[in-house]
């Protein structure tokens, strides 16, 4: 299994290094998750031809995956630290059900899928400490999530492969946009 951030050999070799700041810890955590996604995408792409499909073809899906928009304040035009932070946390909370779906979708990367899920939970905690306006963060309804999970798991094999690919790609894009914005904060 991948080693969580802060526990790699480089850290062991440098025991006198300054402890990471909150921002550095978040940055490292997101990069760790991106590494995990990269490994999962490799397995997915080796197993099916989804990765060759055009973005336009894949866009025709019923998944309501979180996505950054101009109004979220995470892009340079209209950048707003607090609005953006709320969007990042809300989006990550919405992704959790999809990360749960991924748990039984991998054979050789089962531990990696679990690591991505658990690391995302830790990331949410880091970000919640950073946010001032926690009241603005809406938590997904557990009942809705449960029925969504059941629906996704009932799909045929091809649709499940497509769903897996879309979740990984969307989650990667969301994390990249989030990290770019966080690096401005």
């Amino acid at each position: 299994a991948p080693v969580p951030p802060g526990e790699d050999s480089k850290d062991v070799a440098a025991p006198h290094r300054q402890p990471l700041t909150s921002s550095e810890r978040i940055d490292k955590q997101i990069r760790y998750i991106l590494d995990g996604i990269s490994a999962l995408r490799k397995e997915t792409c080796n197993k099916s031809n989804m990765c060759e499909s055009s973005k336009e073809a894949l866009a025709e899906n019923n998944l309501n995956l979180p996505k950054m928009a101009e109004k979220d304040g995470c892009f340079q035009s209209g950048f707003n630290e607090e609005t953006c932070l709320v969007k990042i946390i809300t989006g990550l909370l919405e992704f959790e059900v999809y990360l749960e779906y991924l748990q039984n979708r991998f054979e050789s990367s089962e531990e990696q899928a679990r690591a991505v899920q658990m690391s995302t939970k830790v990331l949410i905690q880091f970000l919640q400490k950073k946010a001032k306006n926690l009241d603005a963060i809406t938590t997904p309804d557990p009942t809705t999530n449960a029925s969504l999970l059941t629906k996704l798991q009932a799909q045929n094999q091809w649709l499940q492969d497509m769903t897996t690919h879309l979740i990984l790609r969307s989650f990667k894009e969301f994390l990249q946009s989030s990290l770019r914005a966080l690096r401005q904060m």
Partner: nanobody, 123 residues
Framework: EVQLVESGGGLVQAGGSLRLSCTAS????????MAWFRQAPGKEREFVTD???????WYADSVKGRFTISRDNAKNTVYLQMNSLRPEDTAVYYC?????????????????WGQGTQVTVSS
Amino acid sequence: EVQLVESGGGLVQAGGSLRLSCTASGGTFSEYAMAWFRQAPGKEREFVTDIGESGGTWYADSVKGRFTISRDNAKNTVYLQMNSLRPEDTAVYYCAADSYGVGGGAERYYDSWGQGTQVTVSS
């Protein structure tokens, strides 16, 4: 790690335009965030602009509205279109790549760098 080669620099008069190119080899270019930094004589290297894997762009305030970054993944190339050039834009311009596809306004976010191309703006 990706190798980067910049081109397109030169001498131009104030108010003029230049287009810099940076061509990458040795990696999956489309998955990298690409950036331009610059270093004027006697000054620190500073962020100019970047473009993420999914195409989002950021600009330094000093170049906003004058410079445009774009990428052509089929050609493994990132461009910097510089218009309304000023003498203070004179610098060596460096191309940089971030393998996480994110980018950012600090040098530490990038794992590959080009050798740089000189841009001189005369008044």
